[in-house]
């Protein structure tokens, strides 16, 4: 099975001779994240040409997807620390429904889809750890995530294939603002 | 093959304007992050400003925060960097950049870059 | 903001010499520092990605090394082609930061 990152001393992306701070260990762990993404959009656009679709065509599925806005205080202009923190969490429990979804629908990289999963709860526990005002962060309810994911299983092939785009390149997105604001904090 | 081709710079006096833009072509545009960099004459390169894929999140050297906006239009393949209130210190050659990778950035590196434009603020 | 400083300015050096240039940042940037070749009249030519990866095409005698706060490009026996100028890039953190820029020229 895929390494966590901090599981492994030959870890590259950790070339550090002591232990890794909270904000590199993050760091590190969104990075890890992001390779396993990429090793699953690989995938996804090998098998399909939704990688080169418009924005026309995606924006005809309607998926409720985090996205990063600038009130969120995450980006360069009217950047905060406490608000930015919170939306990450909390789009990061939003995207959870949606990393269950992809767990059927690699082949070759069903371990990686796997690996992203379980990587990104326990990247949501280390930053819940940081964030100081917990009281904010709203944590999706168990039924309407059930009822979403039938909804998601129920779609026809391409839409399905359409749908696994949409979710690596959103979270993708997500995960490189989360990355970018982390490290203003 | 990628090619990013700047337009849009000229002479102009301090306080005024210009639109720079950079067509892209040879990739998929929407999937890459692009950045403006400048070199005034006889001098190092300066990172001006990035604009990101999808997100719309964008980011400003101090220098020109406040003054300079980078936007992007897909539909066009084409990067823009409206300048105002131009000081003389912003006279250099403007180039457009690709950022490494579409697939998954987590670098940083500009691996194509425009021939440049010409910014000149003088009175 | 995260400062880069980047030596020598200037390295007077022969043909089939060793050269290397150094950057230094004010705080840690992981690995994410990219290193540039300029030739006078030219754009711009990305060497080296993420500190140490060589960009496609770029020859095996330029090497990059280093993470955290010290970072070091290497060319492995100069050659006339190389007489540049170099500039590496912190790209961890806004605003992004050029180093000052190293003149590579013979003695």
């Known amino acids: 099975a895929p390494v966590l990152p901090g599981e492994d001393s030959k870890d590259v992306a950790a070339p550090h001779s002591q232990p890794l701070t909270s904000s590199e260990r993050i760091d590190k762990h969104i990075r890890y994240i992001l390779d396993g993404i990429s090793a699953l959009r690989k995938e996804t656009c090998n098998r399909s040409n939704m990688c080169e679709s418009s924005k026309e065509a995606l924006a005809e599925n309607n998926l409720n997807l985090p996205k990063m806005a600038e009130k969120d205080g995450c980006f360069q202009s009217g950047f905060n620390e406490d608000t930015c923190l919170v939306k990450i969490i909390t789009g990061l429990l939003e995207f959870e429904v949606y990393l269950e979804y992809l767990q059927n629908r690699f082949e070759s990289s069903e371990e990686q889809a796997r690996a992203v999963q379980m990587s990104t709860k326990v990247l949501i526990q280390f930053l819940q750890k940081k964030a100081k005002n917990l009281d904010a962060i709203t944590t999706p309810e168990p039924t309407t995530n059930a009822s979403l994911l039938t909804k998601l299983q129920a779609q026809n092939q391409w839409l399905q294939d359409m749908t696994t785009h949409l979710i690596l390149r959103s979270f993708k997105e997500f995960l490189q603002s989360s990355l970018r604001a982390l490290r203003q904090m | 093959q990628v090619q990013l081709v700047e337009s849009g710079g000229g002479l102009v006096q301090p306080g005024g304007s210009l639109r720079l833009s950079c067509a892209a072509s040879?990739?998929?545009?929407?999937?890459?992050?692009m950045t403006w960099v400048r070199q005034a004459p006889g001098k190092g390169l300066e990172w001006v400003s990035s604009?990101?894929?999808?997100?719309?999140?964008?980011a400003y050297a101090d220098s020109v925060k406040g003054r300079f906006t980078i936007s992007r239009d897909n539909a066009k393949n084409t990067l823009y960097l409206q300048m105002n209130s131009l000081k003389s210190e912003d006279t250099a050659v403007y180039y457009c950049?690709?950022?490494?990778?579409?697939?998954?950035?987590?670098?940083?590196?500009?691996?194509?870059w425009g021939q440049g434009t010409q910014v000149t603020v003088s009175s | 903001d995260i400062q880069m400083t980047q030596s020598p300015s200037s390295l007077p050096t022969s043909l089939g010499d060793s050269v290397t240039i150094t950057c230094q940042a004010s705080?840690?940037?992981?690995?994410?520092l990219s290193w540039y070749q300029q030739k006078p009249g030219q754009t711009p030519k990305l060497l080296i990605y993420?500190?140490?990866k060589l960009q496609t095409g770029v020859p095996s005698r330029f090497s990059g090394s280093g993470s955290g706060t010290s970072f070091t490009l290497t060319i492995s026996g100069l050659e006339a082609e190389d007489l540049a100028t170099y500039y590496c890039l912190q790209g961890y953190s806004w605003p992004f930061m050029f180093g000052q820029g190293t003149k590579v020229e013979l003695k």
């Open positions: 705080q840690s940037i992981s690995d994410e």
């Open positions: 993420g500190a140490s």
């Open positions: 604009i990101y894929s999808f997100s719309g999140d964008t």
């Open positions: 950049t690709r950022n490494l990778g579409g697939v998954v950035v987590t670098t940083n590196g500009y691996d194509y």
């Open positions: 040879g990739f998929t545009f929407s999937n890459y992050y």
